[in-house]
């Protein structure tokens, strides 16, 4: 007998063809011999089956000797053997209906687990293979689990159910809730305004929750809260803010913080957490601030950086358009009795200058 796979909630069309290309009498029955539907001349008749209001046929095809059974809004319990009786013949079709659902919300926090559950008719032994938007394949039986969801797992998951060498495909849209970047570094000269941005990697109709930025200054022995805020329908409102520094926060997404001045005492690392309504767990983004200061005190020209820098970074002092006078993989460099002119302090790595500060040294008379 023919096997047809269907998806829960979908519509299926079971075919039945007579050898005569004309409208003749036919009946569709289930395995209990209960009539589902048939015809009487050109009229569609329905039997007492539980499919009554969901079963139909295509009258336009009867004249061609085709008598399909259409079942709408499929249910797992519709899985059965359906018999088409026409011209003293019986055509049997086995219908197997499957359902695949995410057994939690389809909006999940980065790092959480996704579990997909397969609903299948009794007696079936399907296999399932799912492919994530980034090409990851997972296989299983009745349940499939993916732990530690990543940002790249956002999108349409395509799952193929295989039974009796037939396939049916499901598509499930998953949204991974995360910040666009796990970590970022801002390099600033002393006194410059600092902009911290925390763009989200997803869009939802309504976004409600609360957040906080904790800051660990390089010079401080412990971390402290800098700001707490609420998020209501994508509108940001500050609940509490420290007096030093005087942070300002944007009222709209993306989350945006402004530090009026980069100062050595603020250099360090921050952790912004966002707790979303009806979600367990929090979103995190690390942000780092590196501050540079160039100063001249009497006969000493000094350049210093504060904050979380890689030990590979080079700090240099050079007179404009000349070779570096001093370069060290350290956080402070200096030149004694500097020549007059425009001096540059440079923080650089193998690929670029990350931060630059100019200081004018006046001639000593």
């Amino acid at each position: 007998k023919k096997v047809v796979l269907g998806k829960k909630g979908d519509t299926v069309e079971l075919t039945c063809t007579a050898s005569q290309k004309k409208s003749i009498q036919f009946h569709w029955k289930n395995s209990n011999q209960i009539k589902i539907l048939g015809n009487q001349g050109s009229f569609l008749t329905k039997g007492p089956s539980k499919l009554n209001d969901r079963a139909d046929s295509r009258r336009s095809l009867w004249d061609q000797g085709n008598f399909p059974l259409i079942i709408k809004n499929l249910k797992i319990e519709d899985s059965d053997t359906y018999i088409c009786e026409v011209e003293d013949q019986k055509e049997e079709v086995q219908l197997l209906v499957f359902g695949l659902t995410a057994n939690s919300d389809t909006h999940l926090l980065q790092g959480q687990s996704l579990t997909l559950t397969l609903e299948s008719p009794p007696g079936s032994s399907p296999s399932v293979q799912c492919r994530s938007p980034r090409g990851k394949n997972i296989q299983g039986g009745k349940t499939l689990s993916v732990s530690q969801l990543e940002l790249q797992d956002s999108g349409t998951w395509t799952c193929t159910v295989l039974q009796n060498q037939k396939k049916v495909e499901f598509k499930i849209d998953i949204v991974v809730l995360a910040f666009q970047k796990a970590s970022s570094i801002v390099y600033k000269k002393e006194g410059e305004q600092v902009e911290f941005s925390f763009p989200l990697a997803f869009t939802v109709e309504k976004l409600t929750g609360s957040g906080e930025l904790w800051w660990q200054a390089e010079r401080a022995s412990s971390s402290k809260s800098w700001i707490t805020f609420d998020l209501k329908n994508k509108e940001v409102s500050v609940k509490w803010v420290t007096q030093d520094p005087k942070l300002q926060m944007g009222k709209k997404l993306p989350l945006h913080l402004t530090l009026p001045q980069a100062l050595p005492q603020y250099a360090g690392s921050g952790n912004l957490t966002l707790a979303l309504e009806a979600k367990t767990g929090k979103l995190h983004q690390e942000v780092n601030l590196v501050v540079m200061r160039a100063t001249q005190l009497q006969k000493n020209l000094t350049c210093e950086v504060w904050g979380p820098t890689s030990p590979k970074l080079m700090l240099s002092l050079k007179l404009e358009n000349k070779e570096a006078k001093v370069s060290k993989r350290e956080k402070a460099v200096w030149v004694l009795n500097p020549e007059a002119g425009m001096w540059q302090c440079l923080l650089s790595d193998s690929g670029q200058v990350l931060l630059e500060s100019n200081i004018k040294v006046l001639p000593t008379w």
Epitope: Y187, N288, S310, L313, G351, L354
Partner: antibody, heavy 122, light 107 residues
């Protein structure tokens, strides 16, 4: 497309010198740090040296310090490795590789050449 | 200089297996660690950078984790093309140093 092609390998006697070249194409060579990495026959990878984007800084593995010199000519999009006082243990395939440096935080060698073979033997 | 100790030095596994390779640094390297794959006669290929960032075009069955001194490369479900030698590289400070490699063979 982005490409690195090494040349200059060959058979050389111990104590002699050899200069390897690495021709870069398909990217702005002067914006990247560049490495030499080597692999002795049947052995693992060994980092040799790095030169910064502007040639201002160079760092070496202890095993080659004082004998090898890394240099670059940004106008010719070419990286060099001058190898002096060669020893049998310098026999290896020499690869050049591009270093990506992002935000002074993320570093990686994303593009590699196919390698050139250096054999030091009497 | 920072020493990198990779283990195991060789590993036999089957297609579909989950495989873990570890790398230990002789001192704290924060998250300055990358993983490279090399096949015989070929140049190394970048898989993971800065501990856990998947390089563009690398299959998501590869993942990296760790921080400080202990790091892990995990292949969630081995594919035939994954049989190769894997190296960790500390790029936290100069001189850079590779681990001695892990040869992944078919069981």
């Amino acid at each position: 497309q982005v490409q690195l092609v090494e040349s200059g390998g060959g058979v050389v006697q111990p104590g002699r010198a050899l200069r390897l070249s690495c021709a870069a194409s398909g990217f702005t060579f002067s914006s990247y740090g560049m490495h030499w990495v080597r692999q002795a026959p049947g052995k693992g990878l060994e980092w040799v040296a790095i030169i910064w984007y502007d040639g201002s800084n160079k760092y070496y593995a202890d095993s080659v310090k004082g004998r090898f010199t890394i240099s670059r000519d940004n106008s010719k999009n070419t990286l060099y490795l001058q190898m002096n006082s060669l020893r049998a243990e310098d026999t290896a395939v020499y690869y050049c590789a591009r270093e990506v440096a992002l935000e002074g935080y993320y570093y990686y060698m994303d593009v590699w050449g196919k390698g050139t073979t250096v054999t030091v033997s009497s | 200089d920072i020493q990198m100790t990779q283990s195991p030095s060789s590993l036999s596994a089957s297609v579909g297996d989950r495989v873990t390779i570890t790398c230990r640094a002789s001192q704290d390297i924060r998250n300055g660690l990358g993983w490279y794959q090399q096949k015989p006669g070929k140049a190394p290929k970048l898989l993971i950078y800065t501990t856990s960032n998947l390089q563009s075009g690398v299959p998501s069955r590869f993942s990296g984790s760790g921080s400080g001194t202990d790091f892990t490369l995990t292949i969630s479900s081995l594919q035939p093309e994954d049989f190769a030698t894997y190296y960790c590289l500390q790029d936290y400070n100069y001189p850079y140093t590779f681990g001695q490699g892990t040869k992944l063979e078919i069981k």
